[in-house]
């Protein structure tokens, strides 16, 4: 088989400070040394990219400054995070991965992740 | 508006070279991985070639491998194809298309007609 | 190299009854790496049917999708006139991209 099987959580709850993390695993057909790693969000029929990065095999992930991804790498599985989020940002978040090199090439896509964020109950003023 | 546009086909000969490029305008070129995909005359669809976001990494099918070269320039949002030591058979239209996000190529080009004879 | 099959190489069917195509893979194609295109004459291909079975924004919902492995479907439910044409599948889970040699559907 030549697919690539990308599995992530079904679902995960954000902390009250709007950080979800959740690992995104590949089973790579081949030896890939050069990898690319996206999270897109699926709203409705709509799909938007929110972060990308390539990184070698063995090194860490590197997204750029203004993104709100970290993640880290360890052989065919990726730790990643997703800050700044709000209850509007609930939705479906998929993994999609590239095996750009070697060739061939290879794209994985997960099932989805659905993160539900919960924004923090104001606190009431308190009267002393 | 959404599209691409091909420019550079027309008539040349064998053992010549032709540049044609890819007008891309409405959304976030550098996002998306682009392809070169020809169509014989009366012919189905054939897979040309493929670079990546950034032009990195690029991808190319055997009948067309040392011919012809693959490159993109993200800051005028074009894609192009260079193609060297044409051939009789290299004669098609030639499509530029978009991968989408999940994986299909769901924007194409209108096309370029390529045309190799003596 | 995935090699794609199509069948039948043309289809004769009349308006307002039913169109099935048929896509084989040379080898297992995970099912979200299978598309569908429609191409009619002097246009270029646009897309249908991906990861085999979700509709592209736009397509109307009687074009269907089905399959996994090697085998595929596509299903019109109902021809209307706009139909009749070409059609396409396409992998693209891995290098290189590779398409069917097409299935005509034309008026009976």
């Known amino acids: 088989c030549k697919a690539m099987h990308v599995a992530q959580p079904a679902v995960v709850l954000a902390s009250s400070r709007g950080i979800a993390s959740f690992v995104c695993e590949y089973a790579s057909p081949g030896k890939a040394t050069e990898v690319r790693v996206t999270v897109l969000r699926q709203a409705d029929s709509q799909v938007t990219e929110v972060c990308a990065a390539t990184y070698m095999m063995g090194n860490e992930l590197t997204f750029l400054d203004d993104s709100i991804c970290t993640g880290t790498s360890s052989g065919n599985q990726v730790n990643l995070t997703i800050q700044g989020l709000r209850a509007m940002d609930t939705g479906l978040y998929i993994c999609k991965v590239e095996l750009m090199y070697p060739p061939p090439y290879y794209l994985g896509i997960g099932n989805g992740t659905q993160i539900y964020v919960i924004d923090p109950e104001p606190c009431p003023d308190s009267d002393f | 508006e959404v599209q691409l546009v091909e420019s550079g086909g027309g008539l040349v000969k064998p053992g010549g070279s032709l540049r044609l490029s890819c007008a891309a305008s409405?959304?976030?070129?550098?996002?998306?991985?682009m392809h070169w995909v020809r169509q014989a005359p009366g012919k189905g669809l054939e897979w040309v070639s493929f670079?990546?976001?950034?032009?990195?990494?690029?991808y190319y099918a055997d009948s067309v491998k040392g011919r012809f070269t693959i490159s993109r320039d993200n800051a005028k949002n074009s894609l192009y194809l260079q193609m060297n030591s044409l051939r009789a058979e290299d004669t098609a239209v030639y499509y530029c298309?978009?991968?989408?996000?999940?994986?299909?190529?769901?924007?194409w080009g209108q096309g370029t007609m390529v045309t190799v004879s003596s | 190299e995935i090699v794609l099959t199509q069948s039948p190489g043309t289809l004769s069917v009349s308006p307002g009854e039913r169109a099935t195509l048929s896509c084989r893979a040379s080898q297992s194609v995970g099912s979200s790496y299978l598309a569908w295109y429609q191409q009619k004459p002097g246009q270029a291909p646009r897309l249908l049917i991906y990861?085999?079975?979700s509709r592209a924004t736009g397509i109307p919902d009687r074009f269907s999708g089905s399959g996994s492995g090697t085998d595929f479907t596509l299903t019109i439910s109902r021809l209307e006139p706009e139909d009749f044409a070409v059609y396409y599948c396409?992998?693209?889970?891995?290098?290189?991209?590779?398409f069917g040699q097409g299935t005509k559907v034309e008026i009976k």
């Open positions: 396409q992998q693209y889970g891995s290098s290189p991209w590779t």
């Open positions: 670079i990546s976001y950034d032009g990195n990494y690029k």
């Open positions: 298309a978009r991968t989408s996000h999940l994986g299909p190529f769901d924007l």
């Open positions: 409405g959304f976030t070129f550098s996002s998306y991985t």
């Open positions: 990861g085999a079975f």
